[in-house]
């Protein structure tokens, strides 16, 4: 058979951040190519990344159709130049991925502090509401649109002159915190989905400090 040198894909791994979702696998192909199929538990298989020599396939377009569904992918291996060839059982070699539920498993991307504005002894800190590739009515949804109040942000803030941190939470994208007048503060935020058991937290945002350009001060 022409498949004697064909090996099945292995280490199939979902890499997903803010719903941008790529399936990766091994090995790097030698005299073989791959095709990926994806389906929901109850749906039909859809083929993607036909006869590719890559070891990754962007499946974002498929999973964003319904991020609460559970998906399964499989990677088929074919001999290069003979993609019609089948394995000894009469079908090409393939390997299944783990199941993947985007809503529950996509990693939360590093958030960004959009702005902060001081009015007297209050500071309003706004977190950028990142756009995702999830669509509804032909418009792209933001992270907040998708997760609603399932998504919270934790703010860390501290006086530039000291190391003692404070924290606050919000289930919107805004914090209103009390500060000491005349003091400069630094801010960092983290996204969290409390109801999750995996991939619950993002990495911290870059630190932004008062006295730099993102801020605004009003008496």
């Amino acid at each position: 058979s022409g498949t004697t040198n064909t090996v099945a894909a292995y280490n199939l791994t979902w890499k997903s951040t803010n719903f941008k979702t790529i399936l990766e696998w091994e090995p790097k192909p030698v005299n073989q190519v791959y095709t990926v199929q994806i389906s929901t538990k109850s749906g039909d298989w859809k083929s993607k990344c036909f006869y590719t020599t890559d070891t990754e396939c962007d499946l974002t377009d498929e999973i964003v159709k319904d991020v609460k569904q559970t998906y399964l992918a499989r990677v088929f291996s074919y001999p290069a130049g003979n993609v019609e060839s089948t394995g000894s059982a009469g079908e090409p070699l393939y390997e299944n991925s783990p199941e993947f539920t985007p809503y529950l498993e996509t990693n939360l991307g590093q958030p960004t502090i959009q702005s902060f504005e001081q009015v007297g002894t209050k500071v309003n800190v706004t977190v950028e509401d990142e756009r995702t590739l999830v669509r509804r009515n032909n418009t792209f949804l933001s992270l907040r649109d998708v997760f609603g109040k399932d998504l919270i942000y934790t703010l860390y803030y501290w006086k530039s002159s000291s190391s003692g941190k404070k924290t606050a939470k919000t289930n919107t994208n805004e914090f209103l915190i009390d500060v000491d007048k005349g003091e400069n503060y630094c801010f960092s935020v983290q996204a969290v989905i409390p109801s999750r058991t995996v991939n619950r937290k993002s990495t911290d945002s870059p630190v932004e400090c008062m006295g730099q350009e993102k801020g605004e001060f009003r008496e």
């Epitope: 941190k165 939470k169 915190i177 409390p194 109801s195 058991t197 619950r200 937290k201």
Partner: antibody, heavy 117, light 107 residues
Framework: EVQLVESGGGLVQPGGSLRLSCAAS????????MHWVRQAPGKGLEWVGW????????IYDPKFQDRFTISADTSKNTAYLQMNSLRAEDTAVYYC??????????WGQGTLVTVSS | DIQMTQSPSSLSASVGDRVTITCKAS??????LSWYQQKPGKAPKLLIY???GLADGVPSRFSGSGSGTDFTLTISSLQPEDFATYYC?????????FGQGTKVEIK
């Protein structure tokens, strides 16, 4: 099964130090925030502080900031509370708790710290 | 810092009674409040979190309501195993603060 087990409590003299441990099992501490809460005999609950074990961020009640230090070792899946310059009024049961960011869902059984000469 | 004023500090009630405990925050904490039950010699146990949810394994006779500054824990029909001390906790901003506790005793 999620479990938190505190250890390291005991009798210590005023001015002394103690390090409490909170060993976690059934989950990875880096995925959660970990807190220390204490309760003096016959009194209510008092929050001490938290750590995000993934990045080391710590937050304290200001009254403990100078004497207490929270740390974590993710390889050991354990959080710690280092207490220095202990006073009689630090006598309490010390609990660690897991925080989902919405609630403290699991607590350890507590470890008693007695500060007395 | 946010102060949490819990009332009453203690109450006596009979099995089957409806019991209400309140917590008042010194300023708006939105919905960042949870309720805990503690029995003597034991660790606190999560009962209620917000926006109101019953913790796993907690009987439906427990319920929570409120947002902003005023919060209520209700036990619709007190059972023998409910005699304990109850605490609210605000975790919207640091330092996190507990209410002083409400001891529910047998009348």
């Amino acid at each position: 099964e999620v479990q938190l087990v505190e250890s390291g409590g005991g009798l210590v003299q005023p001015g002394g130090s103690l390090r409490l441990s909170c060993a976690a099992s059934g989950f990875n501490i880096k995925d959660y925030y970990m807190h220390w809460v204490r309760q003096a005999p016959g009194k209510g609950l008092e929050w001490v502080g938290w750590i995000d074990p993934e990045n080391g961020n710590t937050i304290y009640d200001p009254k403990f900031q100078d004497r207490f230090t929270i740390s974590a070792d993710t390889s050991k899946n354990t959080a710690y509370l280092q207490m220095n310059s202990l006073r009689a009024e630090d006598t309490a049961v010390y609990y660690c708790a897991r925080d989902t960011a919405a609630y403290f869902d699991y607590w350890g059984q507590g470890t008693l710290v007695t500060v007395s000469s | 810092d946010i102060q949490m004023t819990q009332s009453p500090s203690s109450l006596s009630a009979s099995v089957g009674d409806r019991v209400t405990i309140t917590c008042k925050a010194s300023r708006d904490i939105k919905s960042y409040l949870s309720w805990y039950q503690q029995k003597p010699g034991k660790a606190p146990k999560l009962l209620i979190y917000y926006e109101p949810g019953l913790a796993d394994g907690v009987p439906s006779r427990f319920s929570g309501s409120g947002s902003g500054t005023d919060f209520t824990l209700t036990i619709s029909s007190l059972q023998p195993e409910d005699f304990a001390t109850y605490y609210c906790l605000q975790h919207g901003e640091s330092p996190f603060t507990f209410g002083q506790g409400t001891k529910v005793e047998i009348k």
